[in-house]
């Protein structure tokens, strides 16, 4: 005997109480595939979530995080508090980046400044809590006789004060 449920399209469920008739999903529920025997409850985007896409009879609601938070995980399963640039989120809240590290976003961790000398370059612009250092030409390129119309200011490693 053919299973009549396989004929039920998305947005409906196969109602065993009514001789396998295809019934529309009740309000606040959906079925995204055909042949379903039940409809799934729609996700509620409340509290720390806000609605990005409303639930329909064939697809679940999609949530975003409210202002001051950002999504984590598949389908925005969690919301994590934003921090300011120059900070990272710890177990005790937002903390400033330690010296020698930076974060240019509202999320994520503080990362070490680029070590320009590893690439044979010098520091053109010092790093800050919010910005990485900018590496410039190698020290050899700045020696007397090097062809440069306007030689850049003396380079310094990050955090070193001028002599």
């Amino acid at each position: 005997l053919q299973d009549l449920c396989s004929n039920c399209p998305a947005g409906t469920f196969c109602d065993n109480n009514r001789s396998q008739i295809c019934s529309p999903c009740p309000p606040n529920s959906f079925s995204s595939a055909g042949g379903q025997r039940t409809c799934d409850i729609c996700r509620q985007c409340k509290g720390v979530f806000k609605t990005r896409k409303e639930c329909s009879s064939t697809s679940n609601a999609e949530c975003d995080c409210i202002s001051g938070y950002h999504c984590l995980g598949a389908e925005c399963s969690m919301c994590e508090q934003d921090c300011k640039q120059g900070q990272e989120l710890t177990k005790k809240g937002c903390k400033d980046c330690c010296f020698g590290t930076f974060n240019d976003q509202k999320r994520g961790i503080c990362r070490p400044w680029t070590n320009c000398s590893l690439d044979g370059k010098s520091v053109l612009v010092n790093g800050t809590k919010e910005r990485d250092v900018v590496c410039g030409p190698s020290p050899a390129d700045l020696s007397p006789g090097a062809s440069s119309a306007t030689p850049p200011a003396p380079a310094r490693e990050p955090g070193h004060s001028p002599q």
Epitope: G47, V48, F49, M78, C79, E80, Q81, L89, G93
Partner: nanobody
Framework: QVQLQESGGGLVQPGGSLRLSCAAS????????MTWVRQAPGKGLEWVSS????????IYADSVKGRFTISRDNAKNTLYLQMNNLRPEDTAVYFC??????????SGPGTQVTVSS
């Protein structure tokens, strides 16, 4: 699917008490820190209190310290918030959340608490 269902809200006079409950399902409740947050009319989300997975570590917002008590029953997969000496400024929709004050997920409709004479 993670489900959190809040209940226990209502209308209460200043100085009164309410006990909120949050029934959890769809995840291993005893593995997670749980949190209460609230949203007053026209305001942003405010963290209220958090409790560690085993219940040994508890923290409160200054605004509710000494008046509210968070607790949990891992055998019943339920989170509680006992609210005493309620004030008009406690009027809000209260949500329970899986996670900490900094990283959380809410899925219930919330429960309305109104403090008014």
């Amino acid at each position: 699917q993670v489900q959190l269902q809040e209940s226990g809200g209502g209308l209460v006079q200043p100085g009164g008490s309410l006990r909120l409950s949050c029934a959890a399902s769809g995840f291993t409740f005893s593995d997670h820190t749980m949190t209460w947050v609230r949203q007053a009319p026209g305001k942003g989300l405010e963290w209220v209190s958090s409790i560690s997975s085993g219940g040994s570590r508890i923290i409160y917002a200054d605004s509710v310290k000494g008046r509210f008590t968070i607790s949990r029953d891992n055998a019943k997969n339920t989170l509680y918030l006992q609210m005493n000496n309620l004030r008009p400024e406690d009027t809000a929709v209260y949500f329970c959340a899986r996670g900490t004050r900094y990283k959380m997920s809410t899925s219930g409709p919330g429960t309305q608490v109104t403090v008014s004479s």
